[in-house]
């Protein structure tokens, strides 16, 4: 099995951006890797974003994705933008070694991301 590590807790900044590292221990020499961020709230699991990349190349999410990221070896630096207080929850990093065979899947324990909406600026007379 493939071990995936990620931080237990991350606090989003005042602009609603949270970053964390997802690191995996590859059992083989993968050339194609897929990274997915899943959000678990209660018993519901939803896909936040996903990207497939070739080892040594840049991580590319879809244009409309709220995620960006960079990869370095067996480490992926993930950034999620546009978060609001209601998005506070457990964000799980899933890593799949897609090619060459054999396929491997690894799932992290999740990063609890806390998002605090900024206080609106008081009106100034």
């Amino acid at each position: 099995a493939m071990h995936v590590a990620q931080p237990a807790v991350v606090l989003a900044n005042s602009r609603g951006t949270a970053s964390f590292v997802c690191e995996y221990a590859s059992p083989g020499k993968a050339t194609e890797v897929r990274v997915t961020v899943l959000r678990q709230a209660d018993s519901q699991v939803t896909e936040v974003c996903a990207a497939t990349y070739m080892m040594g190349n840049e991580l590319t999410f879809l244009d409309d994705s709220i995620c960006t990221g960079t990869s370095s070896g067996n480490q992926v630096n993930l950034t999620i933008q546009g978060l609001r207080a209601m998005d506070t929850g457990l964000y799980i990093c899933k890593v799949e070694l897609m090619y060459p065979p054999p396929y491997y899947m690894g799932i992290g324990n999740g990063t609890q991301i806390y998002v605090i909406d900024p206080e609106p600026c008081p009106d100034s007379d």
């Epitope: 099995a1 493939m2 897929r34 497939t52 897609m98 899947m105």
Partner: antibody, heavy 118, light 108 residues
Framework: QVQLVESGGGVVQPGRSLRLSCVAS????????MHWVRQAPGKGLEWVAV????????YYADSVKGRFTISRDNSKNTLFLQMNSLRAEDTAVYYC???????????WGQGTLVTVSS | EIVLTQSPGTLSLSPGERATLSCRAS???????LAWYQQRPGQAPRLLIY???SRATGIPDRFSGSGSGTDFTLTISRLEPEDFAVYYC?????????FGQGTKVEIK
Amino acid sequence: QVQLVESGGGVVQPGRSLRLSCVASGFTFSSHGMHWVRQAPGKGLEWVAVIWYDGRNKYYADSVKGRFTISRDNSKNTLFLQMNSLRAEDTAVYYCARGGHFGPFDYWGQGTLVTVSS
Amino acid sequence: EIVLTQSPGTLSLSPGERATLSCRASQSISSSFLAWYQQRPGQAPRLLIYGASSRATGIPDRFSGSGSGTDFTLTISRLEPEDFAVYYCQQYGTSPWTFGQGTKVEIK
């Protein structure tokens, strides 16, 4: 709700071909790996093949490698299994199954029976 | 290939009794990637347990899973009439995906 409906099964002679289809609904098809699993009469479950997300990556059981081809059409939410050079031992109920976000096969179709007999 | 061996092959019990099913792997697997399925006669398999111990949506709490490494267990605390079926374990952490040969739980 999630639904998977297989079709295309039937009786076919050894050496001939058959194409199975599985139409999916109720979820984002392209976000899931899709599998074919078969069950010979009175026997257990045997994984056959998987196709990932955009359809580029595929894996097969050794027993069908070189004879079966899995494919998908994400625009039509449909999974396919092209079965060539069929043998008597391929006789089984064929199920399509969705790979859940955490990996297990969380939804299954009702199955379609393929009988290879002369 | 990871081989899964289930025991016993058949379990003869009465409604209300406790059922304990075993699944042994030929090599150590992460508990994150062990599932149990139920298959009633003439029906498709249904996911019961994933990650060795997490119940799938809508599965009653009389079903529980445990284990790690190479030894895993499915427990049905009190058998209901609809629980008499065949149960399969499966590993899904690496290819090829493999199933155990099944345990049939039948009415005594």
